[in-house]
């Protein structure tokens, strides 16, 4: 399709080198298109558009996305070609940031309804750079966090080292939807709640003589609790003793409770202490069976082929461990009888 | 591999020291670090075990309490020190290492040995 | 203190033959107990591991088995190659002491 009628936007992302990051393209359609397509309807309830002439479907992946090839090459489709982009909705999510992500990225929708829909594009000339800013030493992560039923607040990473006074007009989205009332740099929260976590964009103009852009920062939020003041607790095995028959396979799970930690590094592990002799076992990783904002439950397995005469005399010694302190349960085999 | 050093001819009454040097890995809790003996044409003696860990602890023949000595010094090297020698002492010294591997496997190896003779 | 007593201190088999060695503790080793073979001029080689596990690359003619203060090493189709001594040892360090201690050897001439 014939992209020169399709709206312009320039965007700028600087990236951080330190930090992970991820960074999001709206299809930005004209105005009162948008409502049939994504639902980011920047309207007021009373205000009605004149006139829709995009009749697209309401379905919110309507939208396709492309992305343009310098060398002048045809429009090569997202989805098919770029892994670590990913689209949802009318949202064009980048999972990793790097100057490879500069180009030109077009959106229109999917279905065609009228003759009006062909011009129904918008063009997104994204540049991407790494921060050079050292100046800024402490800017604001893009991972945030708000400590529930407490005060606190997100700032914009890319306009956190300037002052509330002379910082530009922000334009903030909270995943995918405008904050109409947010203007600065800073939302403060009076008291954090659980939907406050989410992903923020936000948006400011930079201009020079020649022309303007959007630079864009993507902040994750989550709401979190404060740190837990206890070691972690196992949960399973709750006997130090496990009858066995010889010869046969046997797993053994331990399971434990952690608490909620904002620097969350769990340890658990299995080892074997045989006499005096103790060594660590390879076993299956840890999973998470149980996740919640207050802790976690963490299960890891030992598996034995098959139980020997020696097994009964070892003791195989459940250990975990957070920045509070370890816990450890240690279970021995006895040999069933009859 | 396991290596001992040390060994030669002393008078009786005369102090020494051997040295293991592992190479090829490094100590860890899952097993001991042994000395062993045999005299020419006798059966082999068990001296003394060191637990490799960060334990050391330290396990002896009734008959080598306090006169011999084995020492943890590095990641990769035991000694055992033996002191007021006699000709009784004259022996092939071997370094074993005995215990199980990091997978809970058993692992025996043994250096070629060192002789030691006391005689006047 | 363990002490190893080991019998018979000396035995002949003929090949394809079989050899049992016995080896008893002085008291309870909980199968710490390990069996070596011994050429001239040459360190052990570990044979049997924790009473009756074969170590690796062993032939599986070496059989161990006993518990407890008794404890057996069977040869079984004896071949020239297995004319060597033989020692047990426990291997029972941390106990209250000697837990390392070998027995006195049983050497094997193979006609």
């Known amino acids: 399709f014939n992209i020169s009628g399709c709206s312009t936007k320039k965007l700028l992302w600087t990236y951080s080198t330190r930090s992970e990051e991820e960074f999001v393209l709206f299809c930005d359609l004209p105005e009162p298109q948008k409502s049939h397509f994504c639902h980011r309807n920047r309207l007021s309830p009373k205000q009605v558009p004149e006139h829709l002439p995009f009749m697209g479907s309401n379905d919110l992946s309507d939208v396709q996305w492309y992305q343009q090839p310098s060398n002048g090459d045809p429009l090569e489709d997202i989805r098919k070609s770029y892994p670590h982009i990913i689209q949802d909705k009318c949202t064009l999510h980048f999972l990793t940031p790097g100057v490879n992500n500069s180009g030109s990225y077009i959106c229109r929708p999917k279905m065609i309804k009228s003759p009006y829909d062909v011009a129904c594009c918008v063009k997104m000339i994204l540049e991407v750079k790494p921060q050079t800013n050292a100046s800024c030493e402490y800017s604001a992560s893009h991972k945030q966090d708000l400590l529930l039923g407490s005060t606190g607040s997100i700032s914009c990473p890319s306009l956190s080292c300037q002052s509330d006074a002379q910082s530009p007009a922000v334009t903030w989205y909270k995943n995918g939807k405008l904050l109409s009332v947010e203007r600065s740099n800073r939302i403060v929260v009076d008291e954090v709640y659980d939907y406050h976590q989410g992903t923020y964009v936000c948006d400011y103009t930079q201009s020079d003589t020649v022309s303007s852009w959007t630079v864009r920062a993507v902040v994750q939020v989550r709401t979190i609790v404060g740190d837990t003041k206890l070691k972690p607790d196992i949960l399973d095995p709750v006997e130090d003793t496990l009858e066995v028959e010889l010869g046969k396979p046997l797993t053994i799970s331990c399971k434990a409770r952690f608490g909620f930690e904002r620097v969350f590094n769990p340890v658990i592990k299995w080892y074997i202490k045989d006499s005096d002799l103790e060594w660590e076992v390879s076993v299956p990783e840890a999973k998470s069976i149980k996740s919640t904002l207050k802790d976690e439950i963490i299960e890891r397995n030992i598996i034995l082929e098959k139980v020997t005469q020696r097994d009964l005399r070892r003791k195989f010694v459940c250990f975990v461990q957070n920045s509070i302190g370890n816990t450890t349960q240690s279970v021995q085999l006895k040999e069933k009888r009859g | 591999s396991l290596e001992e050093s040390g060994g030669g001819l002393v008078k009786p009454g005369a102090s020494l020291t051997l040295t293991c040097t592992a190479s090829?890995?490094?100590?860890?809790?899952?097993?001991?670090m042994c000395w062993v003996r045999q005299a020419p044409g006798k059966g082999l003696e068990w001296i003394a075990c060191?637990?490799?860990?960060?334990?050391?602890?330290a396990y002896y023949a009734s008959w080598a309490k306090g006169r011999f000595t084995i020492s943890k010094t590095s990641s990769t090297t035991v000694t055992l020190q033996m002191t007021s020698l006699t000709a009784a002492d004259t022996a092939t010294y071997f370094c074993?290492?005995?215990?199980?591997?990091?997978?809970?496997?058993?692992?025996?190896?043994w250096g070629p040995g060192t002789l030691v003779t006391v005689s006047s | 203190a363990i002490k190893m007593t080991q019998t018979p201190s000396s035995v002949s088999a003929a090949v394809g033959g079989t050899v049992t060695i016995n080896c008893r503790a002085s008291?309870?080793?909980?199968?710490?107990l390990a069996w070596y073979q011994q050429k001239p001029g040459q360190p052990p080689k570990l044979l049997i591991y924790?009473?009756?596990d074969l170590a690796s690359g062993v032939p599986s003619r070496f059989k161990g088995s006993g518990s407890g203060t008794e404890y057996t090493l069977t040869i079984s189709g004896v071949q020239c190659d297995d004319a060597a001594t033989y020692y047990c040892?426990?291997?029972?360090?941390?106990?209250?002491?000697?837990?390392?201690?070998f027995g006195g050897g049983t050497e094997v001439v193979v006609k």
């Open positions: 074993a290492r005995d215990g199980y591997d990091d997978y809970g496997d058993p692992f025996n190896l």
């Open positions: 040892q426990s291997a029972y360090y941390s106990s209250s002491t000697d837990g390392g201690a």
């Open positions: 008291e309870d080793i909980k199968s710490y």
């Open positions: 090829g890995f490094s100590f860890s809790s899952s097993y001991y």
């Open positions: 924790d009473a009756s």
């Open positions: 060191i637990h490799a860990g960060s334990s050391g602890s």
